[in-house]
Amino acid sequence: SGVTCADGPCFNGGLCVGGADPDSAYICHCPPGFQGSNCEKRVDRCSLQPCRNGGLCLDLGHALRCRCRAGFAGPRCEHDLDDCAGRACANGGTCVEGGGAHRCSCALGFGGRDCRERADPCAARPCAHGGRCYAHFSGLVCACAPGYMGARCEFPVHPDGASALPAAPPGLRPGDPQR
């Protein structure tokens, strides 16, 4: 074709070297990211799909970068910010994953995002029929009003002394400990 290095045939910063044989008047040594006989083709480095978890690949030129979806981070979007790894739930709470997020399931008496806030177990008025609620280190205790009984004062006490407990399973009398 008669083209030589003097014609500047190498694009994108390619280095032109005179060919060793008559059939090739020049050879282009391409810089990283380019290919083709004249370094005219950009290598699609993002086609290797380096970004994980649905991240978008961005070829800046000097480097690849991954634009991560919400909930992920890191050079390859490899860090899942929504999992329980390294997530501390205080005061005996346990981390629960789900729905692309995490939350703490708090032990009795604690609340808030990290279970760091003391919760008032009596705030929800758990004692029925006018029973009085007392916060206790192990939870709560209901002091029932006259005529009621049960952990939450949910059962009326009948005048004859019997209580309206739910019917016992066959073979068990009310008051027997269930095995």
């Epitope: 694009f11 994108n12 910063g13 810089p31 990211g33 380019f34 950009r42 480095r45 380096p50 991240g55 978008l56 961005l58 070829d59 800046l60 030129g61 000097h62 480097a63 690849l64 970068r65 991954c66 634009r67 991560c68 979806r69 919400a70 981070a73 890191g74 050079p75 390859r76």
Partner: antibody, heavy 123, light 112 residues
Framework: QSVEESGGRLVTPGTPLTLTCTVS????????MSWVRQAPGKGLEWIGI?????DPYYASWAKGRFTISKTSTTMDLKITSPTTEDTATYFC????????????????????WGPGTLVTVSS | ALVMTQTPSSVSAAVGGTVTINCQAS??????LAWYQQKPGQRPKLLIY???NLESGVPSRFKGSGSGTEYTLTISDLECDDAAIYYC??????????????FGGGTEVVVK
């Protein structure tokens, strides 16, 4: 390796203006380039970049207000419809950074910068 | 949005003294933080990249540190020539950020 801006001048509001960044010592196909502006007495404000492959990315506030394009040796910033709030010194800068790696720490920075070109929008 | 908050906005110290500039990111930026120096009427100059790496030619009196969301630029043995405005800048690559390369508001260093 250097960059230099040109094209800054006094324009009336609504008159499109194109700024040019001319580079020497490196190839625009190998580096992303960025535009940053600085209003008088204010801080630096990132406008957008154009990648080595020619893809532009803009700050959300700059979308529709600016257009970034490039040739083999120059990068342009078009201010589509200037307002008085666009009065500023406009800088272009090359983006450098660590090669893509598995390292948890990577970096990007702007170097070198041009001296800037002043755009004044006034009626 | 990723927001870079720089404190203080201005700091003053005597020649030979030390100043500390803080930069807080609204999200973990994994040490992808740069510091720039800008003198009046001049272009910004890169000082630190990758949170703690000193750009060639920059005196070792400039020290960058930090990780996660908290970063610091410390200038020791202050010289008159250090009087300038200093900016932090980050790159945070998510699909949700509206500014890929935000700058902090700047900190003016006055040398007495």
């Amino acid at each position: 390796q250097s960059v230099e801006e040109s094209g800054g001048r006094l324009v009336t509001p609504g008159t499109p203006l194109t700024l040019t960044c001319t580079v020497s010592g490196f190839s625009l196909s190998r580096y992303a380039m960025s535009w940053v502006r600085q209003a008088p007495g204010k801080g630096l404000e990132w406008i957008g970049i154009i990648t080595g492959g020619g893809d532009p990315y803009y700050a959300s506030w700059a979308k529709g207000r600016f257009t970034i394009s490039k040739t083999s040796t120059t990068m342009d910033l078009k201010i589509t419809s200037p307002t008085t709030e666009d009065t500023a010194t406009y800088f272009c800068a090359r983006m450098i950074g660590s090669e893509y790696a598995s390292s948890s720490e990577y970096y990007d920075a702007f170097d070198p910068w041009g001296p800037g070109t002043l755009v004044t929008v006034s009626s | 949005a990723l927001v870079m908050t720089q404190t203080p906005s201005s700091v003053s110290a005597a020649v030979g003294g030390t100043v500390t500039i803080n930069c807080q990111a609204s999200q973990n930026i994994y040490s992808n933080l740069a510091w720039y120096q800008q003198k009046p009427g001049q272009r910004p100059k890169l000082l630190i990249y990758g949170a703690s790496n000193l750009e060639s030619g920059v005196p070792s009196r400039f020290k960058g540190s930090g990780s996660g969301t908290e970063y610091t630029l410390t200038i020791s043995d202050l010289e008159c020539d250090d009087a300038a405005i200093y900016y932090c800048q980050s790159a945070y690559y998510t699909t949700s950020v509206d500014v890929l390369y935000p700058f902090g508001g700047g900190t003016e260093v006055v040398v007495k």
